[in-house]
Structures are given as structure tokens and as C-alpha cells.
């Protein structure tokens, strides 16, 4: 048995790590193999976390973690039975995936103004709280040409748009996902969409 | 509410033994390292021992080392710290501390008096 | 004699800022990551800073931690006759295999 992908970890910042590999054949992740991490911190225990299965021979364990500071220096560990397959190291703060914002609503009754606000996936005690930004997807279902993307550069987890901007009467579809750049972070997953139907008072023609 | 309640301290001669308890509660105590600090009269702090979450490691300071030992009963949610050989210099207010990368939580403290 | 050095004493008058450093020796290492807490007249220390600059929750964004090399420094903006009491810094040393502690700052709001 032999790891023929080396283990990739990103970290949400808070309380998870997910670390990735894949095996040189088909594997029972979860009864063949674990992998002990541990915080590089003189009182710190190495912890277990047992895989699951990603595909055939693909590996994902989700490594709880207490909370994760920019010093965070984690040593993991990757058995199958008493043989050591991969030994590493990762450094949360240096793989960081945000969480995915989430209740996202379109508020559709401020005239002929669109909000859409979310909540950004963060207590205000950690640190990305206050360094996240956004992009929006707004999609058509009735035309896939018609796809758009907003960036939210700002703090405030809210887009307003003139609802003219987009067609009347038609549904539109609408998600959010984040990202920090004070750590470099990848894109968060997109948020679940929500949808509504755009409609608005189409201003009189002036002739 | 994390609360750690120190008891056990008292006036004992020279060359005497002492047992500190620390009762835990408001947290998982299983799941954290903890540690004891003390402070001399008029003094600063100084650490004198951490004993991490299962018991497996245990550190102290050159000072105690030989004469003190730290133990914990996660059953019970309680820290120990075992003083044996005592001398004047062992003077001091006893925090029991949780920690978390720091010493996080702290107790009010108990007061060993090491005199003849 | 602490491997970490402060200075015994600091002031200043309401409002204003004061830092307090926090030194290691040279053959110090510069791996760890430092702490500072506050100790109250007649009370037991609390944390202030961890992991260098980060606050517990419940601590005012007045007090701010910085770290270069081997030494770290405690700042207090904004300043208040509550702030009046004894700092340490503190770190983890690997080699000594245990926990060292500055010996301590009194800081004294005029």
C-alpha cells in the first residue's frame, strides 16, 4: 500500500481542517488507514482523525481543531496499521478556504432596488470576520447566457442593484461565496442559491 | 463559565509535604494541557509545572524539580500538585492555570507558608 | 534572573499610549510565540494577549501585541486609571522544556 498523492490540507480558519490524498489502489479509507496530526506547542497531544472514503482510491479526513492562530504549525502522521505511509507538516494559516457565507435573501420590496444580503460565516472573534469580501453570481434560468458576477469589496455582507438591471419577469438565481486576501485564501464554496422572480415597473417611454 | 477553584495550601515547617487540588469546571477538562504558576510575596510569577491533557507529558521548572510532582484525575476534573521536601523560598500564592497556547484561565490563588 | 527582561516600571497619564517590551536574551529563540497578561492589585493575572497579538474575547481592543526576533511588545492605547497594575510576558522555551516569565512591569496611570 502506498500513497500515490501526498495528503493537501486547507483550513476554514475556526475549527476545520480537511486533508486530502489518494491511495495507489482501491482503499477502505476508514479501516486501513489514519492520520495523527498534531500542533507543533510543547503541551499539545496528537489527535486521530479517521478518514473517509473520496472515489476509489481517494482519502478525506476532517481534522478538528480547537481554533487556529497565524503561528499554527500542525505535524501529521499518515498509518496504515503500524506503517508509516507519509509524514508532513501543514500550516493552517498558509492553506486558508473560507467558509461558505450563508443565508442568503433577496429582498425584492425596496423599490425597484434589489438587496441581497447574506451572513458572513465568522463570529466576530476571529479574525477573517473583518477581512472577507464577496462575489455574487446572479444567473437567469431561462437564459444561460444571461450569468452575471458582483464583487463586494466592502465589509458589509449586502448588494444592492437596480432590479431594471436585470429582466422583468423572469426568475433569476443568486449565491455567494468569499474570500480573504489578508491570507491569501482560495474562493469559499458557493453558498446554496436562493431564487425569486424579477419583476418591476417598466418606466414610460419618453417620446 | 470556566471557574478553577485552588485549595489545600496552609502554614508547614521546613522539610514538610503539601497536596494542592484544582477543581475544574465550565470547560472539557480532559481536553486541555493544565499548569501550575506561583508568586512569591511581593514577587512575580514563575511557572512551576504543566502536565498536558491525558496526563502523558509532564514538565517542570529546575526549581521543584524532585520535589514536586503533577498529577491529574480527569474522572474528577481535578488537578494536583504533590509538594514534598519544602522549603522557605517555596513561600508563595499557587495559581492553578488552564492552557490554551497561554495560560488562559486562571484560579484566585492559595497560599503556602513554608516556616518554622 | 529571567531569560525574559522588562522594565520594572512604566507610566503615563490618561489617554495617552504606553508600551511595554518584553526582551529575550540573544541565545533566546525567536520560535515561540508570545503572551502577556495583566495582574490587578490583590487579584490573580489574566490573559491579555496570546500567540503574539491576538486578544481573548472580553479584552478591549485598547491593548495590542507586536513580536519582532526575539522580543515582543505590549501597547496601551487610550489609556484609564483601571489599567493601573503589574504586566508579564511570558513564552514557551522548547529548549528548557517549560514555561519563562518576564519579570514584570508595574505601570503607574499619573
Known amino acids: 500500500m502506498k500513497v500515490l498523492q501526498e495528503p493537501t490540507c486547507v483550513s476554514d480558519y475556526m475549527s476545520i481542517s480537511t486533508c486530502e490524498w489518494k491511495m495507489n489502489g482501491p482503499t477502505n479509507c476508514s479501516t486501513e488507514l489514519r492520520l495523527l496530526y498534531q500542533l507543533v506547542f510543547l503541551l499539545s497531544e496528537a489527535h486521530t482523525c479517521i478518514p473517509e472514503n473520496n472515489g476509489g482510491a481517494g482519502c478525506v479526513c476532517h481534522l478538528l481543531m480547537d481554533d487556529v492562530v497565524s503561528a499554527d504549525n500542525y505535524t501529521l502522521d499518515l498509518w496504515a496499521g503500524q506503517q508509516l505511509l507519509w509524514k508532513g507538516s501543514f500550516k493552517p494559516s498558509e492553506h486558508v478556504k473560507p467558509r461558505a457565507p450563508g443565508n442568503l435573501t433577496v429582498h425584492t420590496n425596496v423599490s425597484d432596488t434589489l438587496l441581497l444580503t447574506w451572513s458572513n460565516p465568522y463570529p466576530p472573534d476571529n479574525y477573517l470576520y473583518n477581512h472577507l469580501t464577496y462575489a455574487v453570481n446572479i444567473w437567469s434560468e431561462n437564459d444561460p447566457a444571461d450569468f452575471r458576477i458582483y464583487n463586494v469589496t466592502y465589509l458589509e455582507p449586502s448588494l444592492r442593484i437596480a432590479a431594471s438591471t436585470l429582466k422583468s419577469g423572469i426568475s433569476y438565481r443568486a449565491r455567494v461565496r468569499a474570500w480573504a486576501q489578508c491570507y491569501n485564501t482560495t474562493w469559499s464554496e458557493w453558498s446554496p442559491s436562493t431564487k425569486w422572480h424579477n419583476s418591476y415597473r417598466e418606466p414610460f417611454e419618453q417620446h | 463559565e470556566v471557574q478553577l477553584l485552588e485549595s489545600g495550601g496552609g502554614l508547614v515547617q521546613p522539610g514538610g509535604s503539601l497536596r494542592l487540588s484544582c477543581a475544574a469546571s465550565?470547560?472539557?477538562?480532559?481536553?486541555?494541557?493544565m499548569a501550575w504558576v506561583r508568586q512569591a510575596p511581593g514577587k512575580g510569577l514563575e511557572w512551576v509545572s504543566a502536565?498536558?491533557?491525558?496526563?502523558?507529558?509532564?514538565y517542570y521548572a529546575d526549581s521543584v524539580k524532585g520535589r514536586f510532582t503533577i498529577s491529574r484525575d480527569n474522572s474528577k476534573n481535578t488537578l494536583y500538585l504533590q509538594m514534598n521536601s519544602l522549603r522557605a523560598e517555596d513561600t508563595a500564592v499557587y495559581y492553578c492555570?488552564?492552557?490554551?497556547?497561554?495560560?488562559?484561565?486562571w484560579g484566585q490563588g492559595t497560599l503556602v507558608t513554608v516556616s518554622s | 534572573q529571567s531569560v525574559l527582561t522588562q522594565p520594572p516600571s512604566a507610566s503615563g497619564t490618561p489617554g495617552q499610549r504606553v508600551t511595554i517590551s518584553c526582551s529575550g536574551s540573544p541565545l533566546f529563540p525567536d520560535s515561540g510565540s508570545f503572551n502577556w497578561y495583566q495582574q490587578l492589585p490583590g487579584t490573580a493575572p489574566k490573559l491579555l494577549i496570546y500567540a503574539d497579538s491576538h486578544r481573548p474575547s472580553g479584552v478591549p481592543d485598547r491593548f495590542s501585541g507586536s513580536k519582532s526576533g526575539t522580543s515582543a511588545s505590549l501597547a496601551i492605547s487610550g489609556l484609564r486609571s483601571e489599567d493601573e497594575a503589574d504586566y508579564y510576558c511570558g513564552t514557551w522555551d522548547y529548549s528548557l522544556s517549560g514555561y519563562v516569565l518576564g519579570g514584570g512591569t508595574k505601570l503607574t496611570v499619573l
Open positions: 492555570a488552564r492552557v490554551h497556547r497561554a495560560f488562559d484561565y
Open positions: 465550565g470547560f472539557t477538562f480532559s481536553r486541555h494541557a
Open positions: 502536565i498536558t491533557s491525558s496526563g502523558r507529558s509532564i
